[in-house]
């Protein structure tokens, strides 16, 4: 017998859509072979209607698709706008139509429920609103208006014009009688439930002259949209529930056991602990739509997600909802990278960020996730030479090692740097990744003076002491600027005496600045690396002042002053306020990217779900003239 499995019978009605799942053993060969959906002919052949290789029959043009989910060993055939002509016997299968790897499916499309003459059909999504219109004649204008629901053989009163409301509809139904000019009354039912579906009868008057109108209410549960994303990658759920719920609390929940739907995030400030640091609820538009971004996808994130609107911020019967079935592909194109990076206070971290190697020219960003409200991620640095002012001299984004990975170095760590950071680009939005920085107890490995003052025209020598554990590493000095850290010549002065219990392999490497000029003022880093992979760094601020007496300065660890409290920008720069404008590309929308660098006089984009808030100053490597 065939190992392919699926629904033997599918019954639907005209105008509807069907979503037929076919199951196959997920062997390597099966995963990659052709998938097809064909219609069986009277003479035994099977005519292909759609296949995974891109073929779509003219009969299915614009109304069908076939999606393969190799990780689960399934493929799904969606067919919309069904007509009775679609009724028949079909096969879903693998390989060639005439071979045995297939499953027989009977599709029956009927005209719809057996409706009484003159029945108006209302097809409405779960949680939405329906308005049932009931015409009447003049002689019944002053008489009682009512709506009944057919339960089995008996009509049950739902609402009438004398004020009765059936308890099942309390708080979500009203009866409106139009102005005198219109011979029509309407019954409006909100927050539709699946149990509301059925045959209704509206009536004006109670005698033999009463006017009656039949209505058939079909309440559709949303078919989950299938979403297939890579492990460690990112997913965006776009939720459009309509303007009628624009002011109602929104939520995203994940169905667990039974009808329980555990809130993942909502607009009332709730967020599931498992999503801490890797979720943002993008602010809703005026039409009530919103989106939720989840990064760092894990295997256990797979499942059915519902977004909806309800004052409680969680799923209730009658919530308008949208549904997704998320599959997390473990054969991920996104490489493994550490999800937690630990750094010692006063020292540094070097974070490796993956990106889609096909997009090497994309702009790279690094942002700090903030949990307040619905989550936001203001940018700290980008690959175009912008660094947030508070991070000057201690944060750098490097294109190295390249080929699908960039590096972010953050030094002068304090406990306030602990938190979640996102790596992202203005390209493939699925490649957003999250890393948590933890600050741990300990001493920095590299020893440098605090801040140093150099004298114009003189020579300055700044020491950096490397312990023996870094004997096999390349040691360097560089000058920090917004675009990175430009390497400088340095001198190996032999073993360092700054470390106890450290042998001849420790090293003192000095930076020498000859004939110091004003341009030498700024931040200098010493650090270690292996090839294009960076390790620990330490930062020194060099101030430049005038001095009458000539000579050179040689700075030791003992002579070092405390680091300056505040760095004053030279007059050629000005601090640029960051208005946290929303970069639409940071939320998976297929729009062209405008370079946000010079928008709003140099303000920067932020992955943000709050209002426009001041982000603090920012600096750039080019001058802004007033």
């Amino acid at each position: 017998k065939s190992p392919i499995f699926g629904p033997e019978e599918v019954n639907s009605v005209e105008g509807n859509s069907v979503s037929i799942t076919c199951y196959y053993p997920p062997t390597s060969v099966n995963r990659h072979t052709r998938k097809y959906w064909c219609r069986q002919g009277a003479r035994g052949g099977c005519i292909t209607l759609i296949s995974s290789e891109g073929y779509v029959s003219s009969k299915y043009a614009g109304r069908a698709n076939l999606t393969n989910f190799p990780e689960n060993g399934t493929f799904v055939v969606n067919i919309a706008q069904l007509s009775q002509d679609d009724s028949g016997r079909y096969k879903c299968g693998l390989g060639i139509n005439s071979r045995g790897l297939s499953f027989d499916v009977s599709l029956e499309v009927s005209q719809g429920p057996g409706l009484l003459n003159d029945t108006k059909v209302y097809t409405v999504d779960l949680g939405r609103t329906v308005t049932i219109n009931c015409p009447f004649k003049t002689e019944n204008a002053q008489k009682r208006k009512s709506l009944y629901k057919q339960i089995g053989l008996y009509p049950v009163l739902v609402i009438d014009s004398s004020g009765y409301v059936n308890p099942n509809y309390t708080g979500r139904i009203r009866l409106d009688i139009q102005g005198t000019g219109q011979l029509l009354f309407s019954v409006v039912i909100n927050q539709l439930r699946l149990s509301d579906a059925g045959q209704y009868l509206c009536q004006a008057g109670d005698d033999s002259n009463s006017n009656k109108k039949n209505a058939d209410l079909q309440v559709l549960k949303p078919e989950p949209e299938l979403v297939y994303e890579d492990l460690r990658g990112s997913v965006t759920f776009h939720c459009a529930l309509g303007p009628e719920v624009a002011n109602v609390a929104k939520f995203l929940c994940r169905q667990s056991s039974g009808e329980n739907c555990d809130v993942v995030v909502n607009t009332l400030g709730k967020r599931a602990p498992a999503f801490e640091g890797r979720i943002l609820l993008n602010p809703q538009d005026k039409d009530g739509s919103f989106s939720v971004v989840i990064t760092g996808l894990r295997k256990e994130d797979a499942g059915r997600y519902l977004c909806g609107a309800h004052s409680d911020g969680q799923l209730q019967e009658g919530s308008p909802i949208q549904a997704w079935q998320l599959f997390v592909n473990e054969e991920s194109t996104i490489p493994r990278s550490p999800t937690v990076v630990k750094g010692v206070a006063g020292s540094s971290v070097a974070v490796l960020c993956p990106y889609n190697r096909k997009e090497s020219k994309s702009i790279k960003y690094w942002c700090l996730w903030e949990g307040a409200q619905n989550g936001r991620c203001p940018l700290l640095v980008d690959s175009e030479g912008w660094v947030k002012a508070q991070y000057e001299g201690r944060l750098s984004l490097l294109e190295e090692p390249g080929n699908g990975t960039f590096t972010v170095i953050l030094n002068q760590l304090t406990s306030r740097d602990a938190g979640f950071y996102w790596c992202l680009t203005n390209g493939d939005t699925l490649w957003r990744t999250t890393v948590e920085i933890k600050i741990i107890e300990g001493e920095p490995n590299l020893k440098v003076p605090g801040n140093v003052t150099a004298v114009l025209g003189e020579t300055l020598k700044v020491p950096c002491h490397f312990p023996c554990k870094f004997s096999s590493y390349e040691k360097y000095w560089c000058k920090w600027n917004n675009t990175g850290c430009q390497a400088l010549p340095s001198q190996d002065e032999g073993p360092s005496k700054a470390f106890v219990n450290c042998d001849e392999n420790s090293r003192l490497v000095s930076l020498t600045l000859n004939l110091v000029t004003r341009a030498d003022e700024g931040w200098y880093w010493c650090g270690v690396k292996q090839g294009h992979f960076y390790g620990e760094t330490a930062a020194v601020y060099v101030a430049v002042e005038e001095r009458k007496a000539a000579g050179s300065r040689d700075v030791s660890l003992a002579k070092a002053d405390a680091a300056p409290d505040e760095k004053v920008l030279d007059s050629g720069f000005r601090e640029i306020e960051n208005k946290a404008i929303q970069d639409p590309r940071l939320f998976a929308e297929e729009k062209a990217v405008a370079d946000t660098r010079d928008q709003a006089d140099g303000s920067r984009a932020s992955v943000d779900s709050g209002s426009s808030e001041e982000q603090g100053g920012s600096s750039r490597h080019h001058h802004h003239h007033h």
Epitope: V10, S12, N16, T74, L194, K221, S257, E259, R304
Partner: nanobody, 126 residues
């Protein structure tokens, strides 16, 4: 919570018919599919049939061993799913369980179902 109650089991002769019912109560508004499984003494629970739905579309799945003999159906108004069993064989003897699911990735897998009834005994004598 969703409660499921099976009924209609009993003792029949080979070749006879039987109709099982599964009545659901409680918060059924998120239910997506209802299936029947069976378990014979000393054997594992096995898939028999499942019906899933979306709006007015129904999908019916059957195990090879019951194809052409068993039919699953549902009555939405009564929140009840039926299993019509024709041409019964002694091999069909088992406790039949009704199960409901909110998310069904593969209808044949018992662990995909969130709610289970207590079961009803079907005995087919030769």
């Amino acid at each position: 919570e969703v409660q499921l109650v099976e009924s209609g089991g009993g003792l029949v002769q080979a070749g006879d018919s039987l109709r099982l019912s599964c009545a659901a109560s409680g918060r059924t508004f998120t239910t997506y599919g209802v299936g029947w499984f069976r378990q014979a003494p000393g054997k594992e629970r096995e898939f028999v049939t499942t019906i899933t739905w979306s709006g007015s579309t129904n999908y019916k799945y059957y195990a090879d061993s019951v194809k052409g003999r068993f039919t699953i159906s549902r009555d939405n108004a009564k929140n009840t799913v039926y299993l019509q069993m024709n041409s019964l064989k002694p091999d069909d003897t088992a406790v039949y369980y009704c199960a409901a699911s909110t998310v069904l990735t593969d209808p044949r897998v018992p662990t995909e179902y969130d709610y289970w009834g207590q079961g009803t005994q079907v005995t087919v004598s030769s």
